[in-house]
């Protein structure tokens, strides 16, 4: 079998809401994946599991099942949404994200995704992780790869 390639493209959109009473931020983060099937037979994308971390704390998880079928030598782009919650134990973040004196409230999130594919009864898991900027202060739609946090991806000097 040839490879199945999974490429995390980036954050497509982030929709924010606040609960003033709980000092909590809710971020619905939609991500984009490209899955390429380099085989001469169809491949089933069984599920996608994703989680989002902020400051080493998991703030959101999502799982999509029975997603799609990718034909031979074909590629499909898949969007998936992870609902995240930055809660009261990170109280300082509520202040930051609702601060009027800052116009772009960028926070760095680690996006982790695992894609499970199946063909001929055989399952394969491919994982990716990427650091991304997300604005927690307003609803934002991103150009592809616009939210990439490049510094984290550079090798250390």
């Amino acid at each position: 079998p040839r490879s199945i390639e999974v490429k995390y493209i980036g954050v497509k959109s982030a929709y924010v809401s606040y609960d003033a009473e709980k000092r909590t931020i809710y971020l619905n983060i939609t991500n984009t994946l490209n899955i390429t099937n380099n085989n001469y037979y169809s491949v089933e994308v069984e599920n996608i599991t994703a989680q989002v971390q902020f400051s080493k704390t998991v703030i959101g998880k999502a799982r999509l099942n029975n997603i799609t079928n990718i034909g031979p030598l074909d590629m499909k782009q898949i969007d998936y949404t992870v609902p995240t919650v930055i809660a009261e134990e990170m109280s300082y973040m509520y202040d930051f994200c609702t601060l009027l004196s800052i116009k772009v409230h960028n926070i760095v999130l680690m996006m982790q995704v695992t894609v499970t594919t199946a063909y001929f009864g055989h399952s394969e898991q491919i994982s990716q992780e990427r650091y991304q900027y997300v604005d927690c202060g307003r609803n934002t739609t991103y150009q592809l790869a616009q939210s990439e946090y490049l510094n984290v991806l550079q090798p250390q000097q």
Partner: antibody, heavy 119, light 112 residues
Framework: EVQLVESGGDLVKPGGSLKLSCVAS????????MSWVRQTPDKRLEWVAT????????YYPDSVKGRLTVSRDNAKNTLYLQMSSLKSEDTAIYYC????????????WGQGTTLTVSS | DIVMTQAAFSNPVTLGTSASISCRSS???????????LYWYLQKPGQSPQLLIY???NLASGVPNRFSSSGSGTDFTLRISRVEAEDVGVYYC?????????FGGGTKLEIK
């Protein structure tokens, strides 16, 4: 209904001190940033202080830095403005205002409290 | 500091007709995020200021749609389509693109 009630305004001599208070009701005070804005006798509005909802961020214009101190007590739903080394140009009506993070500005203002600095 | 400039008085208007109030900023208030950080407040006689317009063109909750606002990055206009007696007062523009946040000197709406 959102309500902001300021108090503490007085006649003070130059160089004196005063503490203003603003009691909030009708909304979850601990979830909103707050500001103080003053209106001078010539009716000009001047922003003088801002404090974030959990007091993590505080800002002042240079004109009042070091003389005015904003603080809040979320348990008491109260915003404060401690003023020292008062000058005649501090004479104004002082309004407290709630910040609306969806609008990105101050949306509700109190009725104001008057400070007069004069010898 | 960003300076906000307004005329002290509007042209006198007749009730039921339209009125325009102008404001100019010394620097563009259009941020790279696409938002223009310009606000309009009305202070009615004996009252505290009330928010009319946020982020240049959005009507605050409870504000009648007789009010509208437009502008470029530095020149802004507040329009009242059919002036009513209750619209009398001083109109202030304000910016919070940058600290310190600043206000215009206010424009008093004059009724004929």
């Amino acid at each position: 209904e959102v309500q902001l009630v300021e108090s503490g305004g007085d006649l003070v001599k130059p160089g004196g001190s005063l503490k203003l208070s603003c009691v909030a009701s009708g909304f979850t005070f601990s979830g909103y940033g707050m500001s103080w804005v003053r209106q001078t006798p010539d009716k000009r509005l001047e922003w003088v202080a801002t404090i974030s909802s959990g007091s993590f961020y505080i800002y002042y214009p240079d004109s009042v830095k070091g003389r005015l101190t904003v603080s809040r007590d979320n348990a008491k739903n109260t915003l404060y403005l401690q003023m020292s080394s008062l000058k005649s140009e501090d004479t104004a009506i002082y309004y407290c205002a709630r910040q609306n993070f969806y609008y990105g500005c101050e949306d509700y203002w109190g009725q104001g409290t008057t400070l007069t600095v004069s010898s | 500091d960003i300076v906000m400039t307004q005329a002290a008085f509007s042209n006198p208007v007749t009730l039921g007709t339209s009125a325009s109030i102008s404001c100019r900023s010394s620097k563009s208030l259009l941020h790279s995020n696409g938002i223009t950080y310009l606000y309009w407040y009305l202070q009615k006689p004996g009252q505290s200021p009330q928010l009319l317009i946020y982020q240049m063109s959005n009507l605050a909750s409870g504000v009648p749609n007789r009010f509208s606002s437009s502008g470029s990055g530095t020149d802004f206009t507040l329009r009242i389509s059919r002036v009513e007696a209750e619209d009398v007062g001083v109109y202030y523009c304000a910016q919070n693109l940058e600290l310190p946040w600043t206000f215009g000197g206010g424009t008093k709406l004059e009724i004929k």
